[in-house]
Interface confidence: low
């Protein structure tokens, strides 16, 4: 990723083009950072990846840093919240953006405890902010379903993150082709499935439907 | 600034009980961190004991687990080890450290960046 | 346990030189892997962390890479500061465990 350390002002509004945020708690001003095993909020001027989110497919969100995805534990939802493996079906990981809120299911929301971890828990209302955005929404930056070109799943939409090569890739990536074309995995695994296409160039114009579906003859 | 300083007596005798504390100062021990005790015999290298998080989950190295006790005492903001059965092998300057790290999916990724300035422990009678 | 064997277990050397030690895991340990440098008498500082990535503070002519099994850490320019041993050490499973480190000497 070359994160630095450090997150510059500068830095950070790069990666809020790419769609990756720090999460920040509007009323406690401190950031969500993921840690060995727990979330906790820390100040966010010491901004590393490890507070560097990203909306992904299926509703998940992914921490940079920690490579993984926030999970809702329903064998003990009210414990600290933690990131899990994003294909994991042990957890909820599934997160809905709403007025500020962060809600998973049965009326879950991401709060903070006395301690500064990071819970979810159904009884108040905490709002998160996009850190560096001017009290921006971090509904701002949720999903978009990418949809591939040529590869073998027949414009499937990217599977973001995906497993490949030992890491998670929230984004395309050149990563094993040596003619430089970017591309994604349509399944979580792609070691596993083998399935993927290309990545639409975004500096092209708008990619047509023939480029991405086979014409019936 | 986090800082570690470990106490305890300097010498045990053989089959006795090595008892050290390491005191964190300028942090809290319950933030999401492990705490680890690594040792380092007189001319020798580094070997990690264990360590525990503030929750009192543990870690210990398998070659010492039947001797090895690491506790936290979160109002006192510090956490302790006990050596059992102790012979002249146990030896050593022994370290607390502060590991700091991230888990990766579900694989822990991690590293010791704050370490106590270290206690000499003489087995002997 | 994972072990972890470093070479050369010491080496002289003479400033301004370039040098080079290997830590070889006995199983993959993707790039979980650590390097700290110990002064006589002093307590061990973390250089390198992740393989790859220098910590804060850590003059830039130390340098880590290696993946895997293979891991190298490289003083670019050998300064009177930097004799000391070095170790590497692993956490991608618990027990966290060290090479037997390293003796940089002068020459």
């Known amino acids: 990723e070359g994160v630095a350390a450090a997150l510059t002002p500068e830095r950070l509004l790069e990666w809020q083009d790419k769609g990756i945020f720090v999460i920040q708690s509007e009323s406690l001003k401190k950031c969500i950072q993921a840690g060995k095993s727990v979330l906790t909020l820390e100040n966010c001027k010491q901004a590393n990846k490890h507070m560097l989110w990203k909306w992904v497919s299926n509703h998940g969100l992914f921490n940079i840093g920690g490579s993984g995805c926030l999970g809702l534990n329903f064998s003990a939802p009210e414990q600290p919240l933690s990131l899990y493996e994003c294909d994991s079906t042990l957890v909820s990981l599934r997160w809905r953006c709403n007025r500020k809120m962060i809600t998973g299911p049965l009326q879950y929301s991401v709060q903070v405890a006395h301690d500064n971890t990071v819970v979810a828990s159904r009884k108040y209302i905490h709002k998160w902010i996009s850190y560096g955005s001017g009290g921006g929404d971090i509904c701002e930056y949720l999903h978009k379903d990418l949809h591939t070109i040529k590869g073998n799943t027949h414009g499937m939409p990217c599977m973001f993150p995906f497993q490949y090569n030992h890491q998670w890739h929230h984004e395309c990536t050149r990563e094993g082709r040596e003619d430089d074309l970017l591309w994604c995995a349509t399944t979580s695994r792609y070691e596993r499935d083998e399935k993927w296409g290309f990545c639409p160039d975004p500096t092209s114009a708008e990619v047509g439907c023939d480029t991405i579906w086979e014409k019936d003859l | 600034q986090i800082t570690l300083k470990e106490s305890g007596p300097g010498l045990v005798k053989p089959s006795g009980t090595l008892s050290l504390t390491c005191a964190v100062s300028?942090?809290?021990?319950?933030?999401?961190?492990?705490w680890s005790w690594v040792r380092q015999p007189p001319g020798k290298g580094l070997e990690w004991i264990g360590e525990i998080y503030h929750s009192g989950s543990t870690n210990y190295n398998p070659s010492l687990k039947s001797r090895v006790t690491i506790s936290v005492d979160k109002s006192k903001n510090q956490f302790s080890l006990k050596l059992s059965s102790v012979t002249a092998a146990d030896t050593a300057v022994y370290y607390c450290?502060?590991?700091?790290?991230?888990?990766?999916?579900?694989?822990?990724?991690?590293?010791?960046?704050?370490w106590g300035k270290g206690t000499t422990v003489t087995v002997s009678s | 346990d994972i072990q972890l064997t470093q070479s050369p277990s010491s080496l002289s050397a003479s400033v301004g030189d370039r040098v080079t030690i290997t830590c070889r895991a006995s199983?993959?340990?993707?790039?979980?892997l650590n390097w700290y440098q110990q002064k006589p008498g002093k307590v061990p500082k973390l250089l390198i962390s992740s393989a790859s990535t220098l910590q804060s503070g850590a003059p830039s002519r130390f340098s880590g890479s290696g993946y895997g099994t293979d891991f190298t850490l490289t003083i670019s320019s050998l300064q009177v500061e930097d004799f000391a041993t070095y170790y590497c050490q692993q956490s991608y499973s618990p027990p966290q465990t060290f090479g037997q480190g390293t003796k940089v000497e002068i020459k």
């Open positions: 300028g942090g809290s021990i319950s933030s999401s961190n492990w």
């Open positions: 199983q993959s340990i993707d790039d979980h």
């Open positions: 450290a502060r590991d700091d790290g991230w888990r990766y999916g579900s694989v822990y990724y991690y590293y010791m960046d704050v």
